[in-house]
Each structure stands twice: as C-alpha cells, then as structure tokens.
Interface confidence: medium
C-alpha cells in the first residue's frame, strides 16, 4: 500500500529573467527512493538517480541547475515557462508518487530583478 | 506587489549568534517555501537555507550544523537562527518566499569580526 505523500511549493510565481527553485518532499513512506525525476508537461528538465547523480537534459543544461537538495532551479525565466511541473518519485517498494507545481512567470516591472544567484 | 522586509543582522564576533527575520507581505501565491540566501563582497548572491511549509529543510553544505531556517506561515515570516558564527558568513543575508527570488528585499547585514 502507498502511504507516502508529497508536499511541494505549489503554486509560485515568479518574474521574466529571474531564477526559481522547484521543491518536492516525499514524507510518511519508508519506500527507498530510487530516482527523481523533473518535468514540464511532456519535457523531461532533469533527473536524480539515487545510484548515478544528476543528468540534465541537454537542451535544459544552460537554465537548469541541480538541487537544493531533490529540488531544481530554474535560470533565466522566461514567460514561456509558464505551465505546470511535475517531481516523479520512484520508489521502491511503494512504486511512484507525483508531486505538481504550477509556476507563473511574469513580465519583469523592474530590470534589476533579474537577479542571478547559485547554489553552492 | 511582494514586499520582503530582512531585519535581526549586525556586528557579531566569531562564535556568536544571531537570529534573522524576514516578513513577507502583499499580493503572492502561498506556496509555502521560504528560503534565505546571502552576498558577499564581491561574490555572487548564493543559497543558504530552504524550508517548506511541513518542516521539511534544506542547507548549503558551508552552514548545515550551525544554522536553522523555520517558518511561520501564519505570519508570513520566516527566521534563520545562526550559531557558531565564522568570519566568511560575513555577508547582506536576503529572505525570498514561494520559491520566486524577485523582488529581492533590501537584505540584512551580518559581520562576523572580532
């Protein structure tokens, strides 16, 4: 029986140019997470296997960047990246749990919000 | 429009303590993640610390074991308590909530020095 849950940032928004972090937490299972994976829609952004590390997929790897922790960044937003994200927990033995986020991205008022930073 | 308001830095030998606090007001999504973040003199603004709203939380490597982010929700705040202070945490520490990092605030200024 799956008894785990997933708490994500939910629904977020954040401006053109700027920089976002994508969380999911897989909580209440005792399931041994195998891999994570991170989507747009049909997209694949990224992947996190418990064995191998992260891969980011190539067309991603410029704006897309690794953690904190399970969770993603996304760089250099753009309106285009309005839409619904989706954290893909595979484990074993419960099987996958789905985690959505929605994010908004919205026309920058200021040109110094866009503001840069990283994760060490 | 987003309104983050950093307070609780200062002037600090190494060792110390101090206790940050950032209260998020205005129109935005409540997601419930919070997160801080710092800059130092001339380096790029980096991640410290993220929080979900269930508890759940994340550190950079440089402050896991001597800082502690927590969040109150109902008040939109969120708090960063750092002990054991070094030298190189000498930085304007910036609060961000529901995983958007703009607007930044203003930040708040810790020194670590003797």
């Known amino acids: 029986m799956m008894t785990g849950t997933i708490e994500t940032t939910g629904n977020i928004s954040a401006e053109k140019g700027g920089s976002i972090i994508l969380q999911c937490h897989l909580s209440s299972t005792t399931a041994q997470v195998t891999q994570v994976n991170w989507e747009q829609q049909d997209q694949l952004l990224a992947i996190c296997n418990a064995d191998l590390g992260w891969h980011i997929s190539p067309s991603f790897k410029d704006r897309v960047a690794p953690g904190p922790g399970l969770g993603l960044t996304l760089q250099s937003l753009t309106v285009n990246d309005t839409g619904e994200y989706f954290c893909i927990y595979h484990t074993y033995p419960d099987g996958t749990y789905t985690g959505r986020i929605f994010l908004e991205v919205l026309e920058s008022s200021v040109a110094e919000h866009g503001a840069r930073f990283q994760i060490p | 429009e987003v309104q983050l308001v950093e307070s609780g830095g200062g002037l600090v030998q190494p060792g110390g303590s101090l206790r940050l606090s950032c209260a998020a007001s205005?129109?935005?999504?409540?997601?419930?993640?919070m997160g801080w973040f710092r800059q130092a003199p001339g380096k790029e603004r980096e991640w410290v610390a993220s929080v979900l709203r269930g508890g759940y939380t994340w550190y950079a490597d440089s402050v896991k074991g001597r800082f502690t982010i927590s969040a109150d929700n109902s008040k939109n705040t969120a708090y960063l308590q750092m002990n054991s202070l070094k030298p190189e945490d000498t930085a304007v520490y910036y609060c961000?909530?529901?995983?958007?990092?703009?607007?930044w605030g203003q930040g708040t200024l810790v020194t670590v020095s003797s």
């Open positions: 961000t909530r529901d995983g958007g990092f703009d607007p």
């Open positions: 205005g129109n935005t999504f409540s997601g419930g993640f």
